[in-house]
Amino acid sequence: AWELTILHTNDVHSRLEQTSEDSSKCVNASRCMGGVARLFTKVQQIRRAEPNVLLLDAGDQYQGTIWFTVYKGAEVAHFMNALRYDAMALGNHEFDNGVEGLIEPLLKEAKFPILSANIKAKGPLASQISGLYLPYKVLPVGDEVVGIVGYTSKETPFLSNPGTNLVFEDEITALQPEVDKLKTLNVNKIIALGHSGFEMDKLIAQKVRGVDVVVGGHSNTFLYTGNPPSKEVPAGKYPFIVTSDDGRKVPVVQAYAFGKYLGYLKIEFDERGNVISSHGNPILLNSSIPEDPSIKADINKWRIKLDNYSTQELGKTIVYLDGSSQSCRFRECNMGNLICDAMINNNLRHTDEMFWNHVSMCILNGGGIRSPIDERNNGTITWENLAAVLPFGGTFDLVQLKGSTLKKAFEHSVHRYGQSTGEFLQVGGIHVVYDLSRKPGDRVVKLDVLCTKCRVPSYDPLKMDEVYKVILPNFLANGGDGFQMIKDELLRHDSGDQDINVVSTYISKMKVIYPAVEGRIKFSTGSH
């Protein structure tokens, strides 16, 4: 028997520095977690102790903190090289700055293979990107070889900016011929490494003949065997075992997100490359693991540019940006409108001639808006200003919901109106009218939504049975502020871009902003 140790990360999202337990900015260092310096310590410890070790990343290193905003992926290549990753799969967020924003900082600079079997380049891009990412890579591990085959969510064109010259194929259809090819190359130990979410990971384990292990990402799935060491609740045991259609037991793993854990999976193969046994658990990278001093010094060196960036002007406002709780928790506020407009703008994807855009709606809990911005400071808006407005380090995500769920959400928005509570919704692409004289749960008297399948966008009444795409904070997607109906009833959830980054990009693009209060949210009494 031959033993392989797979160390894996996914959805690190720019958490190069250690973070607090909830993966936001580290405040009390003695209780902070993750970060590449701490990760390196643990990886090196395992590499020294065990003979056959692979360090893999399942995508979405890009996007999530000011590190990505400033360094645009150069930080990913630099620190992943320093940690000596063996392979990485492309995630949807790797395309956030377009194909060029992937090629130049990451693909050309990475010293490790970057993989995806289901992304096919066409047109002029095909020759430009040729060889910079691969469908698979055969890695030597001691005297054995291990094949790593990559995959990426086929939803990427709706979630990011891959452009028109990349085709995202069905994962299973694309993976099978590559795995077959590996078999003909005498490679009998094959890992599928990819970024399509836990459900697709399980399907790949079930359907792709010849895949021995699946290492996934995208859904931030936490798996654990035994008592979990922190706040994350396991979605299943680690590894999660899937019985393939040809009767094999295939371990599937994921390691939550944000570099908080290092996935640790030990696989025992027989001499024919069959998995005999698999066991392990994610390792919580808490403060009991010291940060590696040389990596930490490098982080501190790179940090300097970030501090300079946060005080630079992004754009100007010529109006007061009202982000006060007195406004945003009670009525339409122009800060809410600005943020929602930025959220929609960030999700403009013309992927179908029938649709002007794939999504038109935004909702945002008023309690998530934490500060106004005064225009009487020469109108200047900085990253620092935005960090005061959106201090929680969240993301603006894409969900699919039925109209009936949206109606419940808007009823929840005003079910205890008047107590300055955070669940009051700010909106974009939605016109809502409330009648507060009615009983809670029956206060939404009009709810019109902006069409997407139209050449001239206009507002139509919400249909209860229709499925709508909505952009909202991850906080709401996870049921925060009492929006349990969103968490329970959502049909799809894809994590999006860092909240501050979305708004800062929009302001930089617009240069001068003047959001108004324009009647998106209205109150009435009496009949309609």
Epitope: K111, K137, V138, P140, T184, L185, E271
Partner: antibody, heavy 115, light 108 residues
Framework: QVQLLQSGAEVKKPGASVKVSCEAS????????ITWVRQAPGQGLEWMGW????????NYAQKFQDRVTMTTDTSTSTAYMEVRNLKSDDTAVYYC????????WGQGTLVTVSS | EIVLTQSPSSLSASVGDRVTISCQAS??????LNWYQQKPGKAPKLLIY???NLQTGVPSRFSGSGSGTDFTFTISSLQPEDIATYYC??????????FGQGTKVDIK
């Protein structure tokens, strides 16, 4: 333990062919490819090609593409390499090695091409 | 095809000396590099795999480092039995491989 046993030395005339064998033992033959490397007298090591023992798939170095054929016989766990149209500068020791890690080598087969 | 350039092509050193051999790749090969020792009339012996990992049973005076395009092989304290030719070999693109031209090491 892993062993690769190669056939004995050969003397050939220019234009002739030679077939070198490499018999594997101590492991499952079909689990690892076989690599062939040669070394001319006083010269360095030269990678010639690789064959999959799984299905006979071959990858040859450009230089040997049209003169070399690699084959396997899984029933006897043996790999073969044939070099055709021999020239005097094909005089070399020919080695087989297991897989891609090259931790296990045959003892070498000296092929002398002389008129 | 990736070309490996080894230097020096030969060297003489005294017993106990530190010996360093360099290997430069024409394109980046991550850490996919092996080092071999070959004594006259013998098959090559794998010393270092993946640029820096010592093969089982190989004395710890042998070490390797590097990544990307520049690699180094070191014998920390040369012993009489280390007289041999040393080769680097890259395996960036399975199952292809290429060797450096070799460095002959002898004792002064």
């Amino acid at each position: 333990q892993v062993q690769l046993l190669q056939s004995g030395a050969e003397v050939k005339k220019p234009g002739a062919s030679v077939k070198v064998s490499c018999e594997a033992s101590g492991y499952t033959f079909t689990n690892y490819g076989i690599t062939w490397v040669r070394q001319a007298p006083g010269q360095g090591l030269e990678w010639m090609g690789w064959i999959s023992t799984y299905n006979g798939n071959t990858n040859y170095a450009q230089k040997f593409q049209d003169r070399v054929t690699m084959t396997t016989d899984t029933s006897t766990s043996t790999a073969y390499m044939e070099v055709r149209n021999l020239k005097s500068d094909d005089t070399a020791v020919y080695y087989c090695a297991r897989g891609w890690g090259f931790a296990h080598w045959g003892q070498g087969t000296l092929v002398t091409v002389s008129s | 095809e990736i070309v490996l350039t080894q230097s020096p092509s030969s060297l003489s050193a005294s017993v106990g000396d530190r010996v360093t051999i360099s290997c430069q790749a024409s394109d980046k090969i991550n850490n996919y590099l092996n080092w071999y020792q070959q004594k006259p009339g013998k098959a090559p012996k794998l010393l270092i795999y993946d640029a820096s990992n010592l093969q089982t049973g190989v004395p710890s005076r042998f070490s390797g480092s590097g990544s990307g395009t520049d690699f180094t092989f070191t014998i920390s304290s040369l012993q009489p039995e280390d007289i041999a030719t040393y080769y680097c070999q890259q395996y960036n693109s399975y199952p292809y491989a290429t060797f450096g031209q070799g460095t002959k090491v002898d004792i002064k």
